[in-house]
Amino acid sequence: LYFSRDAYWEKLYVDQPAGTPLLYVHALRDAPEEVPSFRLGQHLYGTYRTRLHENNWICIQEDTGLLYLNRSLDRSSWEKLSGRNRGFPLLTVYLKVFLSPTSLREGECQWPGCARVYFSFFNTSFPACTSLKPRELCFPETRPSFRIRENRPPGTFHQFRLLPVQFLCPNISVAYRLLEGEGLPFRCAPDSLEVSTRWALDREQREKYELVAVCTVHAGAREEVVMVPFPVTVYDEDDSAPTFPAGVDTASAVVEFKRKEDTVVATLRVFDADVVPASGELVRRYTSTLLPGDTWTQQTFRVEHWPNETSVQANGSFVRATVHDYRLVLNRNLSISENRTMQLAVLVNDSDFQGPGAGVLLLHFNVSVLPVSLHLPSSYSLSVSRRARRFAQIGKVCVENCQAFSGINVQYELHSSGANCSTLGVVTSAEDTSGILFVNDTKALRRPKCAELHYMVVATNHQTSRQAQAQLLVTVEGLYVAEEAGCPLSCAVSKRRPECEECGGLGSPTGRCEWRQGDGKGITRNFSTCSPSTKTCPDGHCDVVETQDINICPQDCLRGSIVGGHEPGEPRGIKAGYGTCNCFPEEEKCFCEPEDIQDPLCDELCREQKLISEEDLGGEQKLISEEDLHHHHHH
């Protein structure tokens, strides 16, 4: 048995006479032989579920579900209840109604075995019948909505009449009907005004019925019509077996370059017309088991269940359904030497499915794991300026297909043929398994005899000790010009184009910082800034070379605070900035401020912003004072 609603609403007035009928609650059957028996909870509740008083006023007919006033609720009773409502005005009280046989303990009230009946209380006597508007004569203030389980016996789930109105205003005639299309499974009995289902409902055919209830009021010669929505929702049960969309029960996959733990190797989709079990229970009740194979397979793969609600068309309306994606996932990184082919089977069981038929499917995955060979081009040729600063990125080396690699560890090394000309370093980029070549020793660059640098690039997979090698020829170009004395270590410090371009900084391939002119479009990724190389900094990503020293590209790598209009990077740096952004790496601070506008008002605002920043910086104890910044701003 279950209630057709989880909440009912009616009005209560002071001194309404004992015996006044209030409303009917309705229970629907889960099985044909069930007979409902209704029971009221012992207490009345107020605001915030405050228990107000034992219920001495309202009774229920156990067999019919009729609630009625056993005794009149007088003003003094009402004041007593109000006094217990935690100081809130008592506007609404509620009772719990239980369906027997349910637990006799009055605890939480949860549908389907319990419903709440809310009474809106009016501190006046019942109004004169002639003063009631048609809407008040026809329907409760709160519009009802109904829930009916699919595949259950038909039954009565609503009664239209407002019983207190009928009882206290017998001279007013009220008639009801349901507007519904042809062939809908509901009827409204003209005499009893009871609404019932004609037959068992099927949620997979239709899930929602948006009916309209029509009420016609006759008072003397006057006739008025009131219409309200009358929505019915069909509740699901697990009556559909899982199936394969288009009959596809097998997926084939090749594991080659993507060998990282958690890589999705292949996916098979299962369709279920049901939307139960509910999401909280789904993974527990809708099980998937990788059928036992060899130990290697069990250790290497796992199956992940990803259910998703979808909607499908049925009889011209959309109903919800579930698609279950079963992903075959790598449980560990695979060695590049691994080479095998296997068939895996996954048993899917919709354990709540009651039949007919079986709620079990078998999924098949055919997987080939191919070995990966390390290959480098026969040689690389690059050039570097004698003026390049330390950490300047001058190129990349990459084993064949390295951009496609994941879960494959490749370490790059440089072996120099001339010990005194060992200028470059290499670091492996975690993103694409390439090796970034950078200037590590600027002194060697200046030596006249180091005009050509010869290296051997060695790429190694340490897990298998597999290697690849290539020659690297680096031509050193240009004349050495001494670093400018008095210039900052970091290009990012400079806030104006002229001062940016007159200095070099860490990471600069040309020995000069580069100015990136922003687009001036508010808080933008393309903010103006001074960079060692606009190819790599800022690009919203703190790369493996930039991590070596915060002075290279604080715009991408700073973990400190950013003052002014900006969007922080994830997990660090400036994702987007307003105007010009400059940074003081040792202060762990960046400032994003409007481009220079010769406007006194703006100037004052900027000044205020700087003052705020200055407090943030800790006053005179820090490297940057407000005046420094302010005058710098106008330089």
Epitope: K443, G486, P488, L489, S490, V493, S494, L623, D628
Partner: antibody, heavy 121, light 107 residues
């Protein structure tokens, strides 16, 4: 607070060497270079040279370049200026000075307190 | 090397007077000129950098102007505490030469 603290005054004989230290505090030592400036009694300021505290690169004034060596010890945030083959006209107050990294080239806004080196037989 | 020449080498003025010191570079140095104040027995103090930008904490009666080869330091209203020697310095490239200094006294 940003400051440069120099070693105590020295008295040296002609032909000897002197090594003056300059300890930086309140900032990251490698973020800006240190210059050395001297001032003979009653005379003006004379720039002697500059060291890049990050990589050790140096630039020396022509007048002293054969006799001066500027070095740093980043572990102690200290810069050193060694002047060899001292003569009586090397008697002066020796200052270390730095420019805060506020973008572009900068003048000296931080100075050590000075070290008096007297060369006398 | 670029030479820096200051004039006058000394001057005497009354409190409240407007004082002007000039500095000439033997070749163009753009705006890379600084002015320092040194009081007797004290450390030099930066007043102006980039030819015209007032250093933080320096009174606004000090101002700088010029670009290229000719530069000026002006004290709009001389105060007793301004008695000192003033030096210009170029810093566009090494060597960072100083001028020979201008000694300012109160009449």
């Amino acid at each position: 607070q940003v400051q440069l603290v120099q070693s105590r005054d020295e008295v040296k004989k002609p032909g000897a060497s002197v090594k003056v230290s300059c300890k930086a505090s309140g900032y990251t030592f490698t973020t800006y270079g240190i210059s050395w400036v001297r001032q003979a009694p009653g005379q003006g300021l004379e720039w002697m040279g500059w060291i890049n505290t990050y990589n050790g690169d140096t630039n020396y004034a022509q007048k002293v370049q054969d006799r001066v060596i500027m070095t740093t010890d980043t572990s102690t945030s200290t810069a050193y200026m060694e002047l060899r083959s001292l003569r009586s006209d090397d008697t002066a107050v020796y200052f270390c000075a730095g420019a805060r990294p506020l973008g572009g080239r900068r003048a000296f806004d931080i100075w050590g307190q000075g070290t008096m080196v007297t060369v006398s037989s | 090397d670029i030479q820096m020449t200051q004039s006058p080498s000394s001057l005497s003025a009354s409190v409240g007077d407007r004082v002007t010191i000039t500095c000439r570079a033997s070749q163009g140095i753009s705006h890379y000129l600084a002015w320092y104040q040194q009081k007797p027995g004290k450390v030099p103090k930066l007043l102006i950098y980039a030819a015209s930008t007032l250093q933080s904490g320096v009174p606004s009666r000090f101002s700088g102007s010029g670009s290229g080869t000719d530069f000026t330091l002006t004290i709009s209203s001389l105060q007793p505490e301004d008695v000192a020697t003033y030096y210009c310095q170029k810093y566009n490239s090494v060597p960072w030469t100083f001028g020979q200094g201008t000694k300012v006294e109160i009449k």
